[in-house]
């Protein structure tokens, strides 16, 4: 009886694992083995596929074959007993194009209200992704074990910290990798769960802001308690993206070590041009807080994010404020080619009660003012990218008197 060729051959490639699966054509014939050959592009001869010769099952692994993953190859299979079937040719394919990204390795560390996630590729020193290792980004799904309500977080790197969690609570998550340059989305990791710790006695510092004054950076933050000391650390933002980096080398800022106030001032030349991450930690001598949320700090934006310049047109019950580009020395306007949002603070000259308006537009109406009353206005600009969190210093306050009643037109 003639042996039939095997059919329905599937090639599964995950990272550097090459797996072949196929269907027997004739289940009734026993003791059949299967063998594969492969052929590289531009070659006439077929070569025996090592790892896939005389296979008794319907699956084989040819991961040991050192292929150029960007080069097209062709496979063929036949069944063998006393005689052999005809060859069945599999559609040619390029390993890299066919490959899927395997599940990443995930390691979790718990804080009281945060989880640190360390992610690394599932296959170390992968041949498949050798040229793309630095391009991996990850996404994750996280949920409270008790509720199951999922939150997705996209576009993270090999170390990510999730904040604003609840103490003593179990969270579960799974992570998958992506190579956006090749339109590849990977397979999710197994689910990992971890319980956040008991709430720390000292909370981390909050609301970190950087501004420029003269030739210095001024770093400010908020803190709940008095009589504390603080330290500030920085990290090159790009180091976070590096998958080979297991130790993030946060560095100290000399003028921000053991400061007793909720701000520190240091020379601009401490940082070269670039994007940095900053974090602050509090200590009372016995206990130490966890680190604050990290803020992104771009020296280019920070240096040139100047306070806005504005004109006020006074009416009886409102101000019309027209915001213009800030002026640099020499009175020439600064071109700021990134979107800004404006924070306008105003108050009655005789009172300390401030009111705030946030606007994207450069013409703003301040409503509900009293006639013939002096109001003061100051403004500052913020970048609209939440992560960059850049703010200019406030402009000098400008005070104007509203017009008498019935001049609102």
């Amino acid at each position: 009886k003639n042996l039939k060729s095997p059919q329905k051959v599937e090639v599964d490639i995950i990272d550097d694992n090459f797996i072949l699966r196929w269907n027997r054509s004739d289940e009734s014939v026993g003791n059949v083995t299967f063998s594969f050959d492969y052929q590289k592009t531009g070659m006439d001869n077929w070569i025996k596929l090592s790892g896939c010769q005389n296979i008794t099952s319907t699956k084989c692994n040819f991961s040991s074959l050192k292929l150029n993953v960007y080069e097209e190859i062709k496979l063929r299979i036949r069944a063998e007993k006393e005689n052999t079937s005809s060859w069945y040719e599999v559609d040619s394919f390029t390993p890299f194009r066919k490959a899927q990204i395997g599940p990443p390795e995930v390691h979790l560390e718990a804080e009281d209200k945060a989880i640190v996630i360390h992610i690394s590729p599932g296959t170390k020193d992968s041949v498949m992704w050798a040229l793309d290792g630095l391009s991996f980004t990850y996404s994750l799904v996280i949920w409270k074990n008790s509720s199951g309500v999922e939150e997705r977080i996209e576009n993270i790197y090999s170390r990510h910290k999730i904040y604003k969690l609840s103490p003593e609570t179990t969270y579960c998550l799974k992570v998958k990798a992506a190579l956006l340059t090749s339109w590849k989305i990977g397979v999710y990791s197994p689910v990992h769960c971890i319980k956040t710790t008991v709430e720390n006695e000292l909370p981390p510092p909050e609301n970190i802001e950087v501004s420029v004054q003269n030739q210095n950076y001024v770093l400010k933050w908020d803190y709940t308690y008095a009589n504390m000391t603080f330290q500030v650390q920085w990290l090159h933002a790009f180091l976070k993206r590096n998958p080979g980096n297991h130790l993030y080398k946060w560095k100290q800022i000399p003028d921000c070590e053991n400061v007793k106030t909720t701000q520190c001032v240091f020379p601009q030349n401490v940082f070269q041009k670039g994007i940095y991450l900053l974090r602050v930690q509090a200590s009372d001598g016995n206990n130490t807080s966890f680190w604050s949320e990290e803020i992104k700090f771009d020296t280019e934006i920070q240096a040139f994010l100047l306070p806005p310049v504005f004109n006020i047109r006074s009416l009886s019950d409102s101000f019309h404020i027209y915001i213009g580009a800030p002026k640099q020395s020499g009175n020439t306007p600064v071109i700021q080619d990134y979107p800004l949002i404006y924070e306008i603070i105003f108050w009655e000259n005789t009172s300390n009660a401030e009111r705030k308006i946030i606007e994207k537009k450069t013409d703003v109406t301040v409503p509900n003012l009293k006639p013939l009353t002096v109001y003061c206005v100051k403004a500052r600009a913020h970048t609209m990218d939440e992560k960059l969190n850049k703010s200019s210093v406030f402009s000098d306050a400008v005070c104007e008197k509203t017009k008498p009643g019935n001049t609102s037109k």
């Epitope: 090159h236 790009f238 180091l239 998958p243 130790l247 080398k249 560095k251 100290q252 800022i253 670039g274």
Partner: antibody, heavy 118, light 106 residues
Framework: QVQLQQWGAGLLKPSETLSLTCAVY????????WSWIRQPPGKGLEWIGE???????NYNPSLKSRVTISVDTSKNQVSLKLSSVTAADTAVYYC????????????WGQGTTVTVTS | AIQLTQSPSSLSASVGDRVTITCRAS??????LAWYQQKPGKTPKLLIY???RLESGVPSRFSGSGSGTDFTLTISSLQPEDFATYYC????????FGQGTRLEIK
């Protein structure tokens, strides 16, 4: 003035374990990364691995399977162990401190010559 | 691991010469690069950190520049005590050193 003082066995037989210690005198231990570097005779510098004061480590992938670096914060000491040595491990071994303010190894130990011979 | 390739491997120069040594990284390392000087039988000495910052106590004739993959160490006017071997080193992930550049008297 911070000083790093190194010591350990200088003569080893193949397959033995190299063991070196580096003590930090006159300066703070925490907040720094501590590296071990070696230099075979007449050759360049090769980084072995590093550790921070909390014990987190990072190793040269080519040596990772044989290297253990540890810290004893109570003594301000860093230790290096390299198992299954061969003649290729013959070198001057240095410990060095990475600045806590910038990326550079700013303080070095005096170096320990280790020879592996049968 | 990131490879650092220094060029030249050795060079001869005279006192007073301006000398430039280059260091090329196999992938971008931003500015996390340092330069060291080592004299025979001595420990390496840090000259430049963060690619272009001069270490305290190092003469100003030494300077560093570059970012990304290409870096240079320049000695503006060679002094007799500058004849030594120079190494670059990156801190991007696993630390690696360049193979060294031997600077000898012409």
């Amino acid at each position: 003035q911070v000083q790093l003082q190194q010591w350990g066995a200088g003569l080893l037989k193949p397959s033995e374990t190299l063991s070196l210690t580096c003590a930090v005198y006159g300066g703070s231990f925490s907040g720094y990364f501590w590296s071990w570097i070696r230099q075979p005779p007449g050759k360049g510098l090769e980084w072995i691995g590093e550790i921070d004061h909390s014990g987190k480590t990072n190793y040269n992938p080519s040596l990772k399977s044989r290297v253990t670096i540890s810290v004893d914060t109570s003594k301000n000491q860093v230790s290096l162990k390299l198992s299954s040595v061969t003649a290729a491990d013959t070198a001057v071994y240095y410990c060095a401190r990475e600045s806590k303010y910038y990326f550079g190894l700013d303080v070095w130990g005096q170096g320990t010559t280790v020879t592996v011979t049968s | 691991a990131i490879q650092l390739t220094q060029s030249p491997s050795s060079l001869s120069a005279s006192v007073g010469d301006r000398v430039t040594i280059t260091c090329r990284a196999s992938q971008g390392i931003y500015s996390v690069l340092a330069w060291y000087q080592q004299k025979p039988g001595k420990t390496p000495k840090l000259l430049i950190y963060d690619a272009s910052r001069l270490e305290s106590g190092v003469p100003s004739r030494f300077s560093g520049s570059g970012s990304g993959t290409d870096f240079t160490l320049t000695i503006s006017s060679l002094q007799p005590e500058d004849f030594a071997t120079y190494y670059c080193q990156q801190f991007n992930s696993y630390i690696t050193f360049g193979q060294g550049t031997r600077l000898e008297i012409k």
